[in-house]
């Protein structure tokens, strides 16, 4: 039962991570630049994302422009786009693998196969978490590098946007959820082979689990 609880918690965390990752990739708040107007107040804020850039005026009016040319984008931005999409697709694949092996589904009947699928989904979610982390950390590194670069003027320096924090959260949730699904595996995985171990046991108490966990027909 504890194993099922951990599985549910793991998959809930990964789902939250996936949603966070989707929002992070879609929102144009990766890099933020504030421009000071005549009266020493922020006149405009420019948000840059993976797909578009937006300008928010002091009046609150916002206008966004989708990047018209992929070729015009820096290679790191193109890579971030690709990794973001791949990470989301990998996580979706992980979810499908999990659903096939979940305790409450009947896609796969054998318990050891189910356990293997849950373990696989956990690993896939961890990979997705790492893939999410790469573009976020890379972009943050570029912003911080420019911030401390004396050749970059003050007005040209950007700040970390909300999308980066969402990306870190997404990555953390995917890694944590995937890790939990991997951790449920030893208990899930040993349920299959335990049938055979029980056949050769001379006495039930030699196995630490309660006898109620095993089908009685397996006892010699």
């Amino acid at each position: 039962m504890a194993s099922a609880g951990m599985q549910i918690l793991g998959v809930v965390l990964t789902l939250l991570g996936w949603v966070n990752g989707l929002v992070s990739c879609a929102l144009p708040m990766w890099k933020v630049t504030a421009f000071i107007g005549n009266s020493i107040v922020v006149a405009q804020v420019v948000w840059e994302g993976l797909w578009m850039s937006c300008v928010v005026q002091s009046t609150g009016q916002m206008q966004c422009k989708v990047y018209d040319s992929l070729l015009a984008l820096p290679q790191d931005l193109q890579a971030a786009r690709a990794l973001c999409v791949i990470a989301l697709l990998v996580a979706l694949f992980g979810l499908l693998v999990y659903l096939a092996g979940a305790k409450c589904t009947t896609c796969v009947e054998e318990k050891d196969s189910k356990a293997r699928l849950v373990l696989t989904s956990g690993i896939v979610f961890v990979i997705s978490g790492v893939l999410t982390l790469i573009p976020v950390c890379w972009t943050a590194h570029a912003i911080i590098r420019d911030f401390y670069n004396p050749l970059v003027a003050e007005a040209q320096k950007r700040e970390l946007g909300a999308s980066l924090y969402l990306g870190w959260a997404a990555s953390g949730l995917l890694l944590l959820g995937g890790g939990l699904l991997c951790c449920t595996c030893p208990s899930g995985g040993s349920q299959g082979p335990s049938h055979y171990m029980a056949r050769y046991s001379t006495s039930a108490p030699a196995i630490s689990r309660g006898p109620s966990e095993y089908p009685t027909k397996n006892y010699v």
Partner: antibody, heavy 124, light 107 residues
């Protein structure tokens, strides 16, 4: 400090080609987009196009696209503009100018540092 | 293409006067307007961008305002060295377009 040093004035015959240079110093050449602007005698400013030195990506003003080729040499931090099939309409001062903003595309096309200009005279 | 219109080709002023140069865009450019100063025989010099943000080293007598399609460059107290050509430019999208210029001259 940021400097854009442009090549010497050019005198060319109609139908000929010229290639002018713009050597950048005082900043990381590949980080900033380089624009080119045309100014005919006693006239206003006309945008020619830009090049992103890191990738070589170019964008041109459609009116001048067939006449102009922009290139950049990362090793020497130099941007080049070639003008072909010259006519008297091409007699002008040509400026290279650095894009102020690091913002990738859209909104950020203000030009903060300009070269001293290269004068091109087309005469037979 | 976005057309930038500077309705006045010339503006006469005296030293110490307050002067405003206007520029109208053919469509909303979301305050993505820059102003340049050009003196005879020199290359243009960036004064303001984002309609109201002063570039490094630009005196605070130069201020900018506007939104949507209408933009203004104001010199609060004209100095002799301010007599020059002033261009507005939209930095909203390519192709970049400039106004025809307004020449500030002494009365």
């Amino acid at each position: 400090q940021v400097q854009l040093q442009q090549s010497a004035p050019e005198l060319a015959r109609p139908g000929a080609s010229v290639r002018m240079s713009c050597k950048a110093s005082g900043y990381t050449f590949t980080t900033y987009t380089m624009h080119w602007v045309k100014q005919r005698p006693g006239q206003g400013l006309e945008w020619i196009g830009f090049i992103i030195p890191s990738s070589g990506y170019t964008e041109y003003n459609q009116n001048l696209k067939d006449k102009t080729t922009l290139t950049a040499d990362k090793a020497s931090s130099t941007a080049y503009m070639q003008l072909t099939s010259l006519t008297s309409e091409d007699s002008a001062v040509y400026y290279c100018a650095r894009q102020f903003s690091l913002i990738t595309t859209g909104f950020g096309y203000a030009l903060d540092y300009w070269g001293q200009g290269t004068s091109v005279t087309v005469s037979s | 293409d976005i057309v930038m219109t500077q309705s006045r080709k010339f503006m006469s002023t005296s030293v110490g006067d307050r002067v405003s140069i206007t520029c109208k865009a053919s469509q909303d450019v979301s305050t993505a307007v820059a102003w340049y100063q050009q003196k005879p025989g020199q290359s243009p010099k960036l004064l303001l961008y984002w309609a109201s943000t002063r570039h490094t080293g630009v005196p605070d007598r130069f201020t900018g305002s506007g939104s949507g399609t209408d933009y203004t460059l104001t010199i609060s107290s004209v100095q002799a060295e301010d007599l020059a050509l002033y261009y507005c430019q939209q930095h909203y999208s390519t192709p970049l377009t400039f106004g025809a210029g307004t020449k500030l001259e002494l009365k």
